[in-house]
Interface confidence: low
Amino acid sequence: IWELKKDVYVVELDWYPDAPGEMVVLTCDTPEEDGITWTLDQSSEVLGSGKTLTIQVKEFGDAGQYTCHKGGEVLSHSLLLLHKKEDGIWSTDILKDQKEPKNKTFLRCEAKNYSGRFTCWWLTTISTDLTFSVKSSRGSSDPQGVTCGAATLSAERVRGDNKEYEYSVECQEDSACPAAEESLPIEVMVDAVHKLKYENYTSSFFIRDIIKPDPPKNLQLKPLKNSRQVEVSWEYPDTWSTPHSYFSLTFCVQVQGKSKREKKDRVFTDKTSATVICRKNASISVRAQDRYYSSSWSEWASVPCS
Amino acid sequence: RAVPGGSSPAWTQCQQLSQKLCTLAWSAHPLVGHMDLREEGDEETTNDVPHIQCGDGCDPQGLRDNSQFCLQRIHQGLIFYEKLLGSDIFTGEPSLLPDSPVAQLHASLLGLSQLLQPEGHHWETQQIPSLSPSQPWQRLLLRFKILRSLQAFVAVAARVFAHGAATLSP
């Protein structure tokens, strides 16, 4: 058993049929010694008396809010949550496996630049009685600070018969050094509590590996005289690290016909303009990637040819 | 060239070669499948490679103030990786083809380090750790590790030279 926060405790249980469970001793937080009784949740049934209560925690029915009283007055509470371990593996019932980029991916994180700011998100089908708490650090043995905000519900989607809820959190490294080469990964830890079930999820990454620039901005076409060619120009996204002479991007320009089956013409360039042939009913799209490190491409920015 | 007395390197040449190094480092070891979280229980992690750290003056402001600190750190790293790529880890079994991207990468690391430091002037270089596992299998794993670290290192070096070429060239 360990303390998650004040008056909230997590009991770690090996979860299998007829498991013996864990013996837990609760102590009433009071100077009183006599006349103390214990109850669980809303029930008025007295579970025991005395300053301590010993219970055998085997299942969710044994978890909940234990309260000690004296003469009708509440003295203190202890909330017990369960963390299930099945065959040596902690349960992952609360969050949905996003399966991208690999199986057992519960947390996904992205950064728009090298400022040390990043966003993580996760999915669940649970709509109520759900709380999340997020902690993060750079490195684990001698951790350096990363501050995370509160996790918020950022999207709801209908998937077949199920509703899916996306939660996200923004974190910022306290003393970020955008120009340095990272040697210790960022660690993100999410505590999830659904009713009386506790689970924790972790992710570990270098900012450089989760970089995904925003799409290029101000994408414009300028027809060239007496030609089917156009000059496409764009700018670095506002959110990208500066100066751009240091934090450089490379770009992919694509001409795509109306039909997905039509051949795509692609040009790669380090410049912020390119000359391409604009076909009727086609569109021109541009995306960006860090010039020197192969992290994710941005989403496409697009304009029609006409 | 970063000659004794601290004059400027050939920023544009360094920019071109460092960008080529980035390309070679990724062709030597592209992303295979997807990046993963580390699996616990992987005991062989080698982090004794030189990193370009916050105080090394490789940020835009530090380069403007005095680029020599940063160039010296980059030079140390280039020599370190050049030695690693020429060591038994890469030359031993399982053997690589002579024209593999690793061979080109090795040559380019040497080329850039020579651009930064001509003959007769010596910056202190970091000792290469004795990392020569006996098994081809362990060597293969070290190649992954080293090339991944190198990708991060040359990315920072390429940013330095790109910025230098754009803002510090005479």
């Epitope: 990454f205 | 030597a28 499948g33 992987d42 005991e43 399982p94 992954f144 991944r148 670290s149």
Partner: antibody, heavy 126, light 108 residues
């Protein structure tokens, strides 16, 4: 769902060669990390060699000089050729994909095989 | 080469019983590099356990692996009819990657 589909059974004369293919169907595939394992009738499993990213190809000492492992990325097919066949080479030959593990934060092949072909029986008989 | 010796060669048990299979290495193997496979007649092997104790995808919870150094164990907590098969351990610590000779679990 990726599957490894191997070529059909072969009957070969002693001294000749056999080339077994292993094609991936139904998903992304890289010939990197395809190992070959054989199993003689009623016997155990024996690792022969691997086509390994960043390591060219390498083989168990026992088969060195007789086995050649190649791959054609364009057709998602791996090949194993065994020459100078003898009767004791009669076996089922499997191609197998390495499970991915992690090393310093990055994927590498574990050489533990999480996906297998159905096997190809090679019979060497005069 | 690392030699893996499995014991017993054959294990005769009834459904519902617990099976304990042993794999001993001729020299120390990092637990990162030990796996267990199940093979049924006429089929390819199937990965059960890797990293000595981690279950592969889709493997039932009744299968568990343990051990380190030179001694490793595969345990099937309660045998189901479909578990009667041959089991192989494999090391990937050193090349060549070797397999044990197998333990056949048969119905008593």
């Amino acid at each position: 769902q990726v599957q490894l589909v191997q070529s059909g059974a072969e009957v070969k004369k002693p001294g000749s060669s056999v080339k077994v293919s292993c094609k991936a169907s139904g998903g992304t595939f890289s010939s990197n990390y395809i190992s070959w394992v054989r199993q003689a009738p009623g016997q155990g499993l024996e690792w022969m060699g691997i086509n390994a990213h960043l390591g060219g190809t390498w083989y168990a000492q026992k088969f060195q000089g007789r086995v050649t492992i190649t791959a054609d990325e364009s057709t998602s097919t791996a090949y194993m050729e065994l020459s100078s066949l003898r009767s004791e080479d009669t076996a089922v030959y499997y191609c197998a994909r390495s499970k991915k593990g992690m090393y310093g934060g990055w994927t590498y092949p574990l050489m533990m095989f999480d996906l297998w072909g159905q096997g190809t029986l090679v019979t060497v008989s005069s | 080469d690392i030699v893996l010796t499995q014991s017993p060669a054959t294990l005769s048990l009834s459904p519902g019983e617990r099976a304990t299979l042993s794999c001993r290495a001729s020299q120390s193997v990092s637990s990162n590099y030990l796996a267990w496979y199940q093979q049924k007649p006429g089929q390819a092997p199937r990965l059960l356990i890797y990293y000595a104790s981690r279950r592969a995808t889709g493997v039932p919870a009744r299968f568990s692996g343990s051990g380190s150094g030179t001694d490793f164990t595969l345990t099937i907590s309660s045998l189901e009819p479909e578990d009667f098969a041959t089991y192989y351990c494999q090391q990937t610590s050193n090349t060549p990657f070797t397999f044990g000779q197998g333990t056949k679990v048969e119905i008593k």
